[in-house]
């Protein structure tokens, strides 16, 4: 899915209002310095691509994030504010339902959610080049969405 045409500000508002709190709840008892953030993203569409991947794609050692509250709210926000997103996810959702296991919070999942927090942080606070520039400094996002 191409996230270029999403309403980034609405997704950001959804994140700050609810999703972030669910991520904090999931990470409760874990020090913010415990995991080193290694996953990065260059612009807002890229950040959403990475967020979707980490949230919904099962990985080795962490297969259960899609059932978490933050994941369900993320899915809802993307469905509402990204045109055509929900249609692209129907097949993926069916496959996920079949593959689902019971919720288990592993250290690998905690590390993955820590990476997610970093991606969301980046999504919320992209730095812009000086006013008048038409794109970001280090990527090829030509849409120049405003700072906040």
């Amino acid at each position: 899915y191409d996230f270029t045409n999403c309403d980034f500000e609405k997704i950001k508002a959804a994140y700050l209002s609810t999703i972030s709190k669910d991520l904090i709840t999931y990470m409760s008892g874990t020090k913010s310095t415990e995991f080193n953030n290694t996953v990065s993203c260059s612009n807002r569409p890229h950040c959403l691509t990475e967020i979707q991947s980490l949230t919904f794609n099962p990985t080795a050692g962490c297969a259960s994030l899609a059932k978490e509250m933050f994941a369900m709210k993320t899915k809802a926000a993307l469905a509402i504010w990204c045109p055509g997103y929900s249609e692209t996810q129907i097949n993926a959702t069916q496959a996920m339902k079949k593959a689902r296991k019971s919720k288990v919070t592993t250290n690998k999942c905690l590390e993955q959610v820590s990476q997610l927090q970093g991606l969301w942080r980046r999504f919320n606070r992209p730095l812009l080049k000086q006013q008048g520039s038409s794109d970001y400094k280090d990527d090829d996002d030509k849409h120049h969405h405003h700072h906040h």
Epitope: K12, A13, N37, N124, K137
Partner: antibody, heavy 120, light 111 residues
Amino acid sequence: EVQLVQSGAEVKKPGSSVKVSCKASGGTFSTYNMHWVRQAPGQGLEWMGAIYPGNGETSYNQKFKDRVTITADKSTSTAYMELSSLRSEDTAVYYCAREDDYGEGYFDVWGQGTTVTVSS
Amino acid sequence: DIVMTQSPDSLAVSLGERATINCRASESVDNSGLSFMHWYQQKPGQPPKLLIYRASNLGSGVPDRFSGSGSGTDFTLTISSLQAEDVAVYYCQQINTDPLTFGQGTKLEIK
């Protein structure tokens, strides 16, 4: 706990440049926006610019854009602010500050400040 | 640039009394229903410390005598019962639009 430690006080001549460093410890460096804010004696706070160390992307206050350069070294978790063509009005305390964990955009960790005095 | 104007410039309040500081932005700092306005406290010789984020949310470890309100262009920081340790300069900051801008500061003293 995350800490930001800045380089020591500087005394500079008008027309010269100054480079202030800000070393982060106790947490991830590359995925947080790092900002520079200055405060002239008895004055308020003035935002100069910021950097995302993950890819070196920067944003500058237009007021300083021709004179300020913000860089970061991920290997040492250090951010730098260089200000050129110094004038007496640049005499100030320069702070580095890190944004919060959650993307709210507030500055939750600050360096102790570096005093830069510009005098002939 | 968004200009942040605080009032008053200085304020003297008796211990235990309410202190109110206002901040007006030259244009709205709201976006998608959220207000991107923060408040900081700065004591002499120290860096600023966050008090309130996004207009009304209390920062970590900040006493609940501090509160914030407002939206759009008009915001208020309130200290419900002034304590001696609250003597400081208070700044509002908008982060909705680059460049990020601060108010000129309000100096709070004890009467």
